[in-house]
Interface confidence: medium
Amino acid sequence: EPHSLRYNLTVLSWDGSVQSGFLTEVHLDGQPFLRCDRQKCRAKPQGQWAEDVLGNKTWDRETRDLTGNGKDLRMTLAHIKDQKEGLHSLQEIRVCEIHEDNSTRSSQHFYYDGELFLSQNLETKEWTMPQSSRAQTLAMNVRNFLKEDAMKTKTHYHAMHADCLQELRRYLKSGVVLRRTVPPMVNVTRSEASEGNITVTCRASGFYPWNITLSWRQDGVSLSHDTQQWGDVLPDGNGTYQTWVATRICQGEEQRFTCYMEHSGNHSTHPVPSGKVLVLQSHW
């Protein structure tokens, strides 16, 4: 899995007038990392993990950069013609990646009212756009605006690839995000369902990276997908992730069921508790 830095900037307009506020969210290796609030931009590390990466002294730099990006996007939105009445949004998503072989990828994507209308490969400078006429009209509009100011195009948009990678490398140097592996805590609970049945839920939390296998087994055999219900793998705000899987079983058959967890090449098996709750730290 590559290391990645993702900027998500959103600006709004109301009845054709661009609003002063904006929202910027930054994700590092898929984790919520920084947030720049709408009215007053102040980079806010998302949890202790982000603070550890940034260090107190560097927040001003992020604040300055994110504020600048927000202003640029507001100017772009102001140049989108034919804005209809009501509320509209322009979103820019910028992503850069460093792969294990040290190769890099960078891209930039624009969305209007949530619909993708323009993408750029920041390495090859190649632009792509969807086929729909509305998207193409928007895309030409925005591209033309970006090209109008040649100096800006050169110093800002074409430098984004290098800037993003530079920031990513700076964050990685902190050591906090360097290919770490955090094993999950696994917690199995049971609750009454209908008569004669119970629902057993297996929760994994506090793990990194996000890839995990969590499933219920009966007699060591994985249950079919249609008999299990999975939750999304979600960030928990601490630089780690959480998820769950549940299934319904017959009361009295608990001993046959185990929750199987596999993460970063390690695995563990967790029985259904006879009482209400059982918490086990994976002991690798």
């Epitope: 007699d219 060591g220 055999v221 994985s222 058959e253 185990t258 695995h267 098996t269 967790h270 029985p271």
Partner: antibody
Framework: EIQLVQSGAEVKKPGASVKVSCKPS????????IYWVRQAPGQGLEWIGY????????IYNQQFKDRATLTVDKSTSTAYLELSSLRSEDTAVYYC???????????WGQGTLVTVSS | EIVLTQSPATLSLSPGERATLSCSAS???????LHWYQQKPGQSPRLLIY???NLASGVPARFSGSGSGTDYTLTISSLEPEDFAVYYC?????????FGQGTKVEIK
């Protein structure tokens, strides 16, 4: 390649005990249950029980509960079946098998013939 | 305990013929937990079909399975010489895990 290699044939007297070993390879030993099944000469298959090597949980077929003991040695990735108080009707081929993602018995050992005779 | 009864006990057929083997359960089981195995003389059983109708790895397409509830069927569309063997059904729906007594498919 997934394989389960069992120990060699045994000849035992009535009342004695026998211990059969099963050494899987080609997958993570603790990730799948180990099942034990036996087959008397010319007869069908009979499930003895299974063990989860990771947490050591064992489930027996009730008719073997008093005489069969299933164990694992995680350090050598080996599973064992011990059958005590042997009688002539315990003469059979004993198989170990792996619980699969898609079935209860997806890979089998080659079998161990246990002969009980006075 | 769920008892699986296989029929017929012996099936005498020629290569190229169609074989239909039945497995009847004493009480209803989920189709996810009905499996078929093939065993040749002097060999260990081999997983043939899992969850009623799914072919295990390397099993030829002439084998198929069907059924639900208490009645399940294994079909070999056109017998090949290597198909003559004993076939067992097995249920994993409830403890103890049980096998049928087997159906021997022999050359006529």
């Amino acid at each position: 390649e997934i394989q389960l290699v069992q120990s060699g044939a045994e000849v035992k007297k009535p009342g004695a005990s026998v211990k059969v070993s099963c050494k899987p390879s080609g997958y993570a030993f603790t990730s799948n249950n180990i099942y034990w099944v036996r087959q008397a000469p010319g007869q069908g298959l009979e499930w003895i029980g299974y063990i989860d090597p990771y947490i050591g949980r064992i489930i027996y077929n009730q008719q073997f509960k008093d005489r069969a003991t299933l164990t694992v040695d995680k350090s050598t990735s080996t599973a064992y079946l011990e059958l005590s108080s042997l009688r002539s009707e315990d003469t059979a081929v004993y198989y170990c098998s792996r619980s699969g993602e898609r079935s209860n018995f997806d890979y089998w050992g080659q079998g161990t013939l246990v002969t009980v005779s006075s | 305990e769920i008892v699986l009864t296989q029929s017929p006990a012996t099936l005498s057929l020629s290569p190229g013929e169609r074989a239909t083997l039945s497995c009847s359960a004493s009480s209803s089981i989920s189709s996810n937990y009905l499996h078929w195995y093939q065993q040749k003389p002097g060999q260990s059983p081999r997983l043939l079909i899992y969850r009623t109708s799914n072919l295990a790895s390397g099993v030829p397409a002439r084998f198929s399975g069907s059924g639900s509830g208490t009645d399940y069927t294994l079909t070999i569309s056109s017998l090949e010489p290597e198909d003559f063997a004993v076939y067992y059904c097995q249920q994993g729906g409830s403890l103890p895990l049980t096998f049928g007594q087997g159906t021997k498919v022999e050359i006529k």
